[in-house]
């Protein structure tokens, strides 16, 4: 029976993934019950991705490693809609690392997953980025401009946002 074997495979995958994420929240994609898309609990989901707000304060490098251990990366923001979704879960008095850095200090910003950096889809606070020694990007709230990006020193501990593609089982 096809449906039975599909269910057995799905349960086997769920059990296997429990060593990394003890609980997954899954939804059926469209009308076809063959495909379930899942995010770890209590990550949030938007379009085809899952997001996790890490409240531990760490450097950019340690924050990225923390994400990668979970099968994710520091967040890459591709659209205004995605940023608008993300900020719903952030605290105004905190700053969060993005997956955006300028390792050479030459203003060659790069996303951690090699998504091309597009000046037209950036949300820097006015006057930012403003320091060649500040080579990592955060998102934070400024009362005058709401949520936007700022460059900071990579070693300064911040909270962070992890993002991964939904898990399909």
């Amino acid at each position: 029976n096809f449906m039975y074997s599909k269910t057995v495979k799905r349960l086997s995958k769920l059990r296997e993934y429990q060593q990394y994420h003890p609980s997954l929240t899954c939804v059926m994609e469209g009308k076809d019950i063959e495909d379930w898309s899942c995010c770890p609990t209590p990550w949030t989901s938007f379009q085809s991705s899952c997001y996790f707000i890490s409240t531990g304060m760490q450097s950019w490098t340690k924050s990225q490693k923390n994400c990668s251990v979970m099968g994710a990366d520091l967040v890459v923001i591709n659209t205004r809609e995605e940023q608008d979704f993300i900020i719903q879960n952030l605290k105004r008095n905190s700053s969060y690392f993005l997956g955006l850095s300028d390792p050479g200090g030459r203003r060659h910003w790069q996303w951690v997953d090699q998504t091309p950096y597009n000046e037209n889809v950036t949300f820097w606070h006015s006057g930012e980025p403003n320091n060649l020694d500040e080579r990592c990007a955060i998102i934070n709230f400024r009362s005058s401009e709401e949520w936007g990006w700022n460059d900071i020193h990579c070693h300064v501990p911040q909270k962070s946002i992890c993002k991964m593609k939904k898990i399909y089982i």
Partner: nanobody
Amino acid sequence: QVQLQESGGGSVQAGGSLRLSCAASGRTFSNYAMGWFRQTPGKEREFVATISVSGSSTDYADSVKGRFTISRDNAKKTVYLQINSLKTEDTAVYYCAARLSFDNTALYTSANRYSYWGQGTQVTVSS
């Protein structure tokens, strides 16, 4: 946790071949995308090759394309790097790296996307 141990390095003449191995222990190997990187003194770790969780996708640095081949054996929990037509500029310490991936075909070419690293194995190519 995943532990990685490289082997197979050594000294070889230009034009020669080596097969590097990276044995993994710890968590389910078949859920980890794998990569090989190399480093020479005073330089950053450089991407060499990567292979997806399923083994169906691979990618290589331009400098090694056509000469290096990455493969994996999930049953043996091992990833391999076959290196042929060696050049003196291939001299480096070669590191194997692992990264959890829930995507069967995803490839990772950037060092900071990997969570776990081996200690490295030295490859020396002389003319």
